[in-house]
């Protein structure tokens, strides 16, 4: 437990003082928080947060779903943790299945077990599937298992988390993992016709066609040397995984002579940008 | 850094048993996951069995399940592997390893290339 000088503000003390504590199904958690200056106890696994004005922390019967994180709390904002595994041989894997991976960063199937002493905490492909070669983890029993530099190959990929028992693989429920592509090259940008030459009261449309690995590409048209926002339409298309392609039309219903000049589909992502104009020229009706 | 040594290693009939150990020295040695490794002769080396830092939560390859135990003594800064049911084809020699982010793959196969750090070695023969 913490020792500091007196005086100085020191971190609550918690009973069991140990980091970890192991409890079974059924049985009792107590902790107790010492602190002349306690606020409260705060419990976390997952997406859940518990809170408790009590200095002593009582679960009459545990469940697996009481396995996590128990934070003391003091008036300093000082604090100190202790985490509970509850033992519970049916119930061996806390899930959260939502499970999205940026490409080339790392990302967590949210697992965590109830009971750290097992063997082999692993991922395992659905289906006896093996799972891709180059796919590597680190397992954290507290926080689920990490998959290491996501790849753009993973988009869909089933997986468990398993442990080992008794000769046979235990499995979590399954896990589809998204994967979210990284912007590896500017998007590539075409416009319908490099110019026009129109009549005045005649209508200009002008359509540009933005493909890029996610919509998350940003677009617009723009009037050389000009601030003015301009009127345009969108569609847009998923072509499969990672080929998305937008059609920004831009429309002026009655051309005028002074509609004439460059106008350009700009187009950007966080790898760099990427334009195409077209000219307009608009004559009189004489 | 951080020095492993091993020893334990030496020669044994088939059915026999062993007891390796590799002490740690230099960094915290309760903040590393440690295992064990093995090149047979004119093999390349394997995943033996690791340990994580927790010292509870274990790793074994196919070939050693339900015959070696890897465990861990935090106080005296050593990992263990103890070999039961000994096999000829579990001579090789045996080298202790240490990783402060191990990375597995596929079948709980530590992969070698998160080892931070590698022992000498003792060698294991099991004779027939």
């Known amino acids: 437990q913490p020792s500091v000088s007196p005086g100085e503000p020191s971190p609550p003390s918690i009973h069991p003082g140990k980091s970890d504590l192991i409890v079974r199904v059924g049985d009792e958690i107590r902790l107790l928080c010492t602190d002349p200056g306690f606020v409260k106890w705060t419990f976390e696994i997952l997406d859940e947060t518990n809170e408790n004005k009590q200095n002593e922390w009582i679960t009459e019967k545990a469940e697996a779903t009481n396995t996590g994180k128990y934070t003391c709390t003091n008036k300093h904002g000082l604090s100190n943790s202790i985490y509970v595994f509850v033992r519970d041989p049916a119930k061996l894997f806390l899930v959260d299945r939502s499970l999205y991976g940026k490409e080339d960063n790392d990302t967590l199937v949210r697992c965590p077990l109830t009971d750290p002493e097992v063997t082999n905490y692993s991922l395992k492909g659905c289906q006896g599937k093996p799972l891709p070669k180059d796919l590597r983890f680190i397992p954290d029993p507290k926080a689920g298992i990490m998959i290491k530099s996501v790849k753009r190959a993973y988009h869909r990929l089933c997986l468990h988390c398993s442990v080992d028992q008794e000769g046979k693989s235990v499995l979590s429920e399954k896990f589809i993992l998204k994967v979210r592509p990284a912007f590896k090259a500017v998007p590539v940008v075409s416009v319908s016709k490099a110019s026009y030459l129109l009549r005045e009261g005649e209508e200009f449309t002008v359509t540009c066609t933005i493909k890029d690995v996610s919509s998350s590409v940003y677009s617009t048209w723009k009037r050389e040397n000009s601030q003015t926002k301009l009127q345009e339409k969108y569609n847009s298309w998923h072509h499969g995984d990672f080929n998305y392609e937008r059609q920004a039309t831009l429309t002026i219903s009655s051309a005028r002579v002074n509609d004439s000049g460059v106008f350009m589909c700009y187009a950007n992502n966080t790898f760099g940008s990427a334009n195409v104009t077209t000219t307009l020229e608009v004559v009189d009706k004489g | 850094q951080v020095q492993l040594v091993e020893s334990g290693g030496g020669l044994v009939q088939a059915g026999g048993s062993l007891r390796l150990s590799c002490v740690a020295s230099?960094?915290?040695?309760?903040?590393?996951?440690m295992g064990w490794f093995r090149q047979g002769p004119g093999k390349e080396r394997e995943f033996a069995a690791a340990?994580?830092?927790?010292?509870?939560?274990?790793y074994y390859a196919d070939s050693v399940k339900g015959r070696f135990t890897i465990s861990r003594d935090n106080a005296k800064d050593t990992v263990y592997l103890q070999m039961n049911s000994l096999k000829p084809e579990d001579t090789a020699n045996y080298y202790c390893?240490?990783?402060?982010?191990?990375?597995?793959?596929?079948?709980?196969?530590?992969?070698?290339?998160?080892?931070?750090?590698w022992g000498q070695g003792t060698q294991v023969t099991v004779s027939s």
């Open positions: 390893a240490a990783a402060f982010t191990p990375e597995f793959r596929d079948g709980g196969i530590w992969d070698d290339a998160s080892v931070d750090y």
């Open positions: 230099g960094r915290t040695f309760s903040s590393y996951a």
């Open positions: 340990i994580l830092s927790n010292g509870l939560t274990t």
